[in-house]
């Protein structure tokens, strides 16, 4: 997977550390053509005008409908790799010619990432890390996946689950030395099928904060300490992924 | 102690291919990326590519990447960079660093000489 | 692929001067910026990571700053010892670029 890149659609840097939640998180990635609604730029999540709506996101601060996304990311934009065997495809060798959607300027492709796909986090992650993924769940899905990787550990597993028993979950947990923990489980279920969906993930001094289309939905202690070793995000599941970036703020 | 200690300087022909090593010590080598850079004499860096220990993923600098291929050992915590159809223009000092921000360290270099 | 630019190769200072050596993406990197220290006939070293983080045991005299396409390395009282190239990188997209480096010497 070369040349691929943060989205180039980041509203700068240098905020203050964000004060409480919800709330202003600052500068995150606004998103392949943003998203329509959000009353107060740069805001996070859904932050209205400082003053206004306070602890909560505005009315009407996440597009609901689908088309909410233009079809291809922003220039800039992680392409995904291409998909193979197993859960997260690895990229050992030079890719075959066509393994990647044709390309518009910085190497953005032009269509939408490949799932599973990896998120190369080559610092690791540390606190006000800022990570944003959006893209639309598949009509009839059953599951999306986000894998925190710590090496062949996973330190923040967040599975939304479409159809447990006849009832939606999001199962969080973490895997050590290939041992599952014990899991911690959130019935608030934010995702629709066939719908566009914003997912943050705030890295915390003890804790990742989720926040689902402008809106706080969970937090997860950390349980792998070494956050500096989390190096690698693995998103997977019945999704179409538009993009994925990181900044801090 | 993050320690990255990488093989010896080599004098190699013009054609052949050259595999430096880098040998990991001191933290978790499946849970940072390493990365190669190149440093010609006198002149400035550059970024040859990246390898996940963990699962092998690579993420190459376009401009090397018909030149050079990265692999590790996890049984021995080394990073391997092959170096093929050597030129002259590869002779230089190649560097593996680890990534991860906290530690961030370089090894010592290993100097490659390509001469007939 | 981005380009990093610092615009001075060689910075001339005196012991106890400030001095800032800049660094310029030719697009936005979102402040995923390192600075590194190579003083002759030594690996780099890295100073400062996410464009103002100071690596751990970096005197403070080091700081680094800076957002979107402009960042700076400043040294607040430059010591005999800071006699070094340094070089900028940005680790926002692959290939992970770095400047073409600045010399700094020491009058």
């Known amino acids: 997977a070369d040349n691929f890149s943060l989205h180039d659609a980041l509203s700068g840097s240098g905020n203050p550390n964000p004060q409480g939640w919800p709330g202003a998180w600052g500068n995150q990635p606004a998103g392949a053509g943003g998203y329509p609604g959000a009353s107060y730029p740069g805001a996070y999540p859904g932050q209205a005008p400082p003053g206004a709506y306070p602890g909560q996101a505005p009315p009407g601060a996440y597009p609901g409908a689908p088309g909410a996304y233009p079809g291809a990311p922003a220039p800039g934009v992680y392409p995904g790799p291409p998909s193979g065997p197993g859960a997260y495809p690895s990229s050992g060798q030079p890719s075959a010619t066509g393994a990647y959607p044709a390309t518009g300027p910085y190497g953005a492709p032009a269509g939408p990432l490949i799932v599973p796909y990896n998120l190369p986090l080559p610092g690791g992650v540390v606190p006000r890390m800022l990570i944003t993924i959006l893209g639309t769940v598949k009509p009839n899905a059953n599951r999306i996946a986000l894998d925190f990787q710590r090496g062949n550990d996973v330190a923040f597993h967040f599975n939304p689950r479409f159809n447990e028993n006849n009832r939606r979950v999001i199962v969080c947990n973490t895997k050590l030395d290939n041992n599952w923990g014990r899991e911690e489980r959130q019935s608030v279920f934010p995702f629709e099928s066939g719908k566009p969906f914003k997912i943050q993930v705030l890295v915390e001094p003890d804790h990742f904060k989720v926040a689902v289309n402008d809106a706080h939905l969970l937090q997860y202690n950390h349980r792998v300490k070494k956050l500096n070793e989390i190096s690698k995000l693995g998103i997977s599941g019945d999704i179409d992924l538009t993009s994925a970036s990181y900044t801090m703020i | 102690q993050v320690q990255l200690q990488q093989s010896g300087a080599e004098l190699v022909r013009p054609g052949a291919s050259v595999k430096l090593s880098c040998k990991a010590s001191?933290?978790?080598?499946?849970?940072?990326?390493m990365n190669w850079v190149k440093q010609r004499p006198g002149q400035g860096l550059d970024w040859i590519g990246m390898?996940?220990?963990?699962?092998?993923?690579?993420h190459y600098n376009q401009m090397f990447k018909d030149k050079a291929t990265l692999t590790v050992d996890k049984s021995s915590n080394t990073a391997y960079m092959q170096l093929s159809r050597l030129t002259s223009e590869d002779s230089a000092v190649y560097y593996c660093?680890?990534?991860?921000?906290?530690?961030?360290?370089w090894g010592q270099g290993t100097t490659l000489t390509v001469s007939s | 692929d981005i380009l990093m630019t610092q615009s001075h190769k060689f910075m001339s200072t005196s012991v106890g001067d400030r001095v800032s050596i800049t660094c310029k993406a030719s697009?936005?990197?979102?402040?995923?910026v390192v600075w590194y220290q190579q003083k002759p006939g030594q690996s780099p070293k890295q100073l400062i990571y996410?464009?103002?983080t100071r690596h751990t045991g970096v005197p403070d005299r080091f700081t680094g700053s800076g957002s979107g396409t402009d960042y700076t390395l400043t040294i607040s009282s430059v010591q005999a010892e800071d006699l070094a190239l340094y070089y900028c990188q940005q680790h926002y997209s692959t290939p992970y670029t770095f400047g073409g480096g600045t010399k700094l010497e020491i009058k």
């Open positions: 390898i996940d220990p963990s699962d092998s993923e690579t």
């Open positions: 996410w464009a103002s």
């Open positions: 001191g933290y978790t080598f499946t849970s940072s990326w």
């Open positions: 697009q936005d990197v979102s402040s995923v």
């Open positions: 660093v680890n990534s991860n921000y906290e530690s961030g360290y």
